[in-house]
Structure formats: C-alpha cells, structure tokens
C-alpha cells in the first residue's frame, strides 16, 4: 500500500532505535571516510525530520522518497569533493541515477586502519558512560569497512555486543570474559559480511533471477516439507529483502525482513517443524535464528527424481510450457533431497539439466537423449566431494596455520601477479574453512566448505576487479558465480609469470616482530612465504618447508636473545643467504 510519507511509515514500523541504527549504517556505508560525529549529526537531523512527518504526514518534504531525502543530506556535507573526489559528481544527478552512482562508489577495500578493540577497562568505561554512543561507534566502524553488510543483521550483532559488554563489564576479570566472546562475534560477523557480499554480487552481476535460484535451492534444503508454492513465495520475499539491502534501501530491507520473519512464524505448519524456538525470540534474534535454522527432517516417501524429470514423456512439453517454473521445480525437488550438497553444486546441476533439455528437446527423439542426464551429474558431484576430502585431510594433518600456508603457496603459484597482502588475506580466510567445516559431520562438510570458499573467492574477485593483474583470476572471475570455485581449484602454476628478483630487504626482519600478537606474527611469516613463492614459483614443498622452518627457528632464537637487535642484524643476513641457497 502507498503511504503519504515513506519516512514516517518506516519510522513507525521500525521504532526509533532501529530507525536510527539503520540510517547510521546507510550513511556509513555510502560515505566511508566520514567520522562518527559527522554521521551521528546527520542521523539526528534525519530522525528529527522523521518525527515531524509522523506528527503530520503532509508537512513539507515528508512526501519525498527516502533516496531523495538521504541523498540530499549526503550531498549537503561540506568538503565532499575534497574528501571523496568524483563521488561528489553523483550529487549533480537526479534520483534514481544519484543513488546508483553512490552505490557504484562503495569501496570494498577502503583504506581505513584495522578496527582495533580497546582494552577491556577502557571499553567498559565508555560503554557504561554512554551505551548508545558506544553502539553507534560499533555500527559506524563495521559499516564503513563493510559497505554491503546486511544491515538488519548488523543490528543483531550490535545487540550481541551490547549483551556481552553488559555481562562482562560486571565481572572482576573483564578481559578474560570479553575476549573470547567478542572474538566469537567478530568471527561470525566477518563470515556474515563475505556471505552477504556474495549475495549482492549475484544480484548486481546476474540479476534477481540468479539470486532467486540460489534462494530456492537453499530454502528447499532447509524446508524439505514445504511445497513448491511455499518455497517460491519465501524465495520471492527473500529476494526482495536482499535486493533492497544490496541497493542501499536499508529501512525497507529491515522492515520487509521483519515481515518475512512474521510470516514464517505464522505459517510454521506449512514451512517447517523446526521454527518454534526461533519464533519465541525477539525480532532481531528471531530473524537471525530463522536465517540459520537447522534443516527439517526430509519426508520419508519422496519418489526418485527421475520419475518427473527423466522418465516422464512430458518433460519437453512441460519445459516448453513454462521453462522457469519447470527448472525451478527441478531445483526444488533436487535440493530438498540433498541437504548434503552445497547450493553452488545444486545450481551447477540445475544448469546442466537446463543445458541438456535445451539440446535434447530440439532433437527428434528427446527421451533417448535426456535419458542419461542423471548419470552425467556424477562427475559434477564427485569433484567437490574430492575437494572436501583432500582439503580436510590436509587440514587435519597440518592444523589451521599450516593449512593456510599450503593454500597460500598454491594460490600464489596460480596467480603470482596478485598483491601479496591480497594473497595472504585470501589464504588466511580460505584456510579457516578447515576449522569451520572439517570438524562437522560428514553430511554437512560439503555445503559448508564449498559455499564458504565461494564467498571468499568472491571477495578475491572484487579486489582483483579494482586492479586486474592476473589473467588466471580474470578468467575465473568473469564466469558465472557457481563456476568460480571449480575454476580456481582447476588453476595450475601460471607459466607466463616471470619470477620476481630476490630482494634481501623483503626478508629482513627487526626485533619489533617479537612483541607482535601471534596473528600479526603469522601474517609477517606468510607475507615472506608468498614472496618466496613469487621468487621461485616452482620451488618444491620440501624446499619451502626447509626455508620456513629455518625462518621460524631464527625468529624464536632472536626473540629469546638478550640483545634482540644485535641478533636480528647479525643472524638476519645469514638467514637470507641460507634461503637463497636452499631455493637455488
């Protein structure tokens, strides 16, 4: 239904707290360099204006679209061109082009310092002094670093943060209470960020149809007892919610997400038997819980997939009558039978089935042609299964850090032209798949591994798009989203690469490395490892292990030495010489 004032409608639906949080996220995701105070001022102005519209929907400007209202606010910021360069040109455009322009200027890798967590005491002091401002800072800092973070989900993480601080700041040992809990939230939020970015990429590059196919597969796996009409309705609604969030329409997105959660809880009987626990929770927790609810039990009496999609003489007729519906039904039926497959794999199978029908239905005897289609799925299924087995075996043997290093070597060989920081970030993220997925039961490993890897590789593609340097990466990133992971896996050593010359300074370290936190130490060592591979792309695993062991020993010795600086300056050059010899 149309509302006289869109802003009043959203304010009423969402309530002041969520309204302000979402407006802050929106502004922080569009203008990523502005300070918290600048954005907080704008948020307050927008909120005050929304309140005047609630009081009188006919008041001046209350009938304007949210894009117009928000865009006008952003464009009124002083020194916009000095701080944001060509983004200021967006302000010369009219809606909807202006909003599109803002979206195009979102930076996936903004040059902002890493978000450092203050020490426990300081954190608790500022939290107690002003919880609202403290949470505002959290939303601002996360949103500006992750310009596509799923806004209603970010409100959920802020709520989690709030609960942890409330609990831990009352403890005697604040540090040991806060650290593991906040680390857990941070890890989950980072995974949520890359997953949502993948959804927005799907929407941006391949349109709503591609995202809806993803949603149908995912929902069918989770709700195998829901019928196709129900899954289609949920997928359509979920597509709308994600389209809005990806498009910067955060108030509409959060409002529609709340509506979808309400619908699901009111229709549990036709959706799933597993929803009740989620539905008992308050809004943000409810929506979050529904998004990762466990799979319902599969119906026991499902007929073989072949009956309707291979053996039926009507296959081509049904396909001709409604291609998308027929393929959607296939995806639904296949997905509900395979919670053990990744969504990416299910979409590849649906694509293979579509290609088979396109070819076979044009023949004189289609059934003879498409009769073997299910057997042709076998290699497509085996490939990711082998990937999971090989990688989980390696993870179990090496542990997370060693596994990350193995991946780093592999990916540096595949795309040595990519910058070392990007390779290290990617390898560290890809390597976490072991800890995240390899410990799960067998039937959950494949969906966990492949869908997580796909999301991480999407980030690799986004970063590479800004400065394309590797033909290998360009090739894999320009294909369809579901083919990316197999494409990257299939890449081998880039034979066109001219090895980097050996620079001693790249491998020169100083005593300051000794006081770094373990994570930072690992990054330094992994940076050196990537540089070694760039110098000797065909170095054997044994050679690289020798060098890295020597390097670790050197760090250990010098960091324990009484005179660290002397140790580093005398032993460092010896290490460099030994490295060169080992790789010669």
């Amino acid at each position: 239904e149309a509302h006289k004032s869109e802003i009043a409608h959203r304010y009423n639906d969402l309530g002041e707290q969520h309204f302000k949080g979402l407006v802050l996220i929106a502004f922080s995701q569009y203008l990523q360099k502005c300070s918290y105070d600048e954005h907080a001022k704008l948020v307050q102005e927008v909120t005050d204006f929304a309140k005047t519209c609630v009081a009188d929907e006919s008041a001046a400007n209350c009938d304007k679209s949210l894009h117009t209202l928000f865009g006008d606010k952003l464009c009124a910021i002083p020194n916009l061109r000095e701080n944001y360069g060509e983004l200021a040109d967006c302000c010369t455009k009219q809606e909807p082009e202006r909003n599109e322009c803002f979206l195009q200027h979102k930076d996936d890798n903004p040059s902002l310092p890493p978000f450092e967590r203050p020490e426990a005491e300081a954190m608790c002091t500022s939290f107690k002094e002003n919880p609202t401002t403290f949470m505002g800072h959290y939303l601002h800092e996360v949103a500006r670093r992750h310009p596509y973070f799923y806004a209603p989900e970010l409100l959920y993480y802020a709520e989690q943060y709030n609960e942890i601080l409330t609990q831990c700041c009352a403890e005697a040992d604040k540090e040991s209470c806060l650290t593991p809990k906040l680390d857990g939230v941070k890890e989950k939020a980072l995974v949520s960020s890359v997953r949502q970015r993948m959804k927005c990429s799907s929407m941006q590059k391949f349109g709503e149809r591609a995202f809806k196919a993803w949603a149908v597969a995912r929902l069918s796996q989770t709700f195998p007892n829901a019928d196709f009409a129900e899954i289609t309705k949920l997928a359509t609604d979920l597509t709308k919610v994600n389209k809005e969030c990806c498009h910067g329409d955060l108030l509409e997105c959060a409002d529609d997400r709340a509506e979808l959660a309400k619908y699901m809880c009111e229709n549990q009987a036709t959706i799933s038997s597993k929803l009740q626990t989620c539905c008992d929770k308050p809004l943000l927790k409810k929506a979050h819980c529904l998004s990762e609810v466990e799979h319902d039990t599969m119906p026991a009496d499902l007929p073989a997939i072949a009956a309707d999609f291979v053996e039926d003489q009507e296959v081509c007729k049904n396909y001709a009558e409604a291609k998308d519906v027929f393929l959607g039904t296939f995806l639904y039926e296949y997905s509900r039978r395979h919670p053990d497959y990744s969504v990416s794999l299910l979409l590849r199978l649906a694509k293979k089935y579509e290609a088979t029908l396109e070819k076979c239905c044009a023949e004189a005897n289609p059934p003879a042609c498409y009769g073997t289609v299910l057997a042709e799925f076998q290699p497509l299924v085996e490939e990711p299964k082998n990937l999971v087995k090989t990688n989980c075996d390696l993870y179990e043997k090496l542990g997370e850090y060693g596994f990350q290093n193995a991946i780093l070597v592999r990916y540096t060989q595949k795309a040595p032209q990519v910058s070392t920081p990007t390779l290290v970030e990617a390898a560290r993220n890809l390597g976490r798949v072991g800890t995240k997925c390899c410990t799960l039961p067998e039937d959950q490993r494949l969906p966990c591994v492949e869908d997580y890897l796909s999301a991480i590789l999407n980030r690799v593609c986004l970063l590479h798009e800004k400065t394309p340097v590797s033909e290998h990466v360009t090739k894999c990133c320009s294909g369809s989203l579901v083919e990316r992971r197999p494409c990257f896996s299939a890449l081998t050593v880039d034979e066109t690469y001219v090895p980097k010359e050996f620079k001693a300074e790249t491998f020169t370290f100083h005593s300051d490395i000794c006081t770094l936190p373990e994570k930072e130490k690992q990054i330094k060592k992994q940076t050196a490892l990537a540089e070694l591979v760039k110098h000797k792309p065909k170095a054997t695993a044994e050679q690289l292990k020798t060098v890295m062991d020597d390097f670790a020993q050197f760090l250990d010795t010098c960091c324990k030495a009484a005179d660290k600086d002397t140790c580093f300056s005398t032993e460092g050059p010896n290490l460099v010489t030994r490295c060169k010899d080992a790789l010669a």
Epitope: Q313, E314, V315, C316, A320, E321, C361, A362, E363, A364
Partner: nanobody, 115 residues
Framework: EVQLVESGGGLVQPGNSLRLSCAAS????????MSWVRQAPGKGLEWVSS????????LYADSVKGRFTISRDNAKTTLYLQMNSLRPEDTAVYYC????????SSQGTLVTVSS
C-alpha cells in the same frame, strides 16, 4: 501460454492424400522437437512421427514409413504432416505434441479414410 492448433483433417478415400498443419505459439518453436500422435476410435494413443527443432532429423513409426512425411516451417512456427496412400486403418484424431510427449493438450484434427 503454449497453444497448438491442428487443421487439415477431413474425409478421404483410400489411396488419397491429406496435409495436416499445426500452428504453434507461446514457446520458442525452433528450439523444440515436435511429434504427431494419433488416436483411433476406441484405441490408445499411438506415436506417428517426430522431427528435430532444426528439421534435419526425422523419425517414423513402421506403420507409416514411406507414406507419411513430417516437416516444419520455423519462420511460420508451423508443423506439417503430408499423408499419402492413406488406408482405412489411418482413421484417427491426429494431434501435434511437443518433444516426445504422448499426451496431447490440443483438440486435434479428425482424419477419416473410407470408401
């Protein structure tokens, strides 16, 4: 919406000829193989002939081989069945179908072969 409309049926004497047409709409005609099936009075459906989307591959039931010719005009989205040397046992309602379908969704056209 997919629509198939058959025409060209009628009463003919044994040994004579008829040409059936099937006008198709609502789908990408050239992307689909097409078939003719028939149903004689009091009998089940019987497959007669099929043709690929491009028109360069054809199949016939043994009972009509050498007498019937299937063809298509993709520009006009029309399927044809040229029936020569008709026999009384060819009497049936003829339907065009998409792909290998044996269940017609159209009205069909009646062919009666009788002296």
């Amino acid at each position: 919406e997919v629509q198939l409309v058959e025409s060209g049926g009628g009463l003919v004497q044994p040994g004579n000829s008829l040409r059936l047409s099937c006008a198709a709409s609502g789908f990408t005609f050239s992307s689909f193989g097409m078939s003719w099936v028939r149903q004689a009075p009091g009998k089940g459906l019987e497959w007669v002939s099929s043709i690929s989307g491009s028109g360069d591959d054809t199949l016939y039931a043994d009972s009509v081989k050498g007498r019937f010719t299937i063809s298509r005009d993709n520009a006009k989205t029309t399927l044809y069945l040229q029936m020569n040397s008709l026999r009384p046992e060819d009497t049936a309602v003829y339907y065009c179908t998409i792909g290998g379908s044996l269940s017609p969704s159209s009205q069909g056209t009646l062919v009666t072969v009788s002296s």
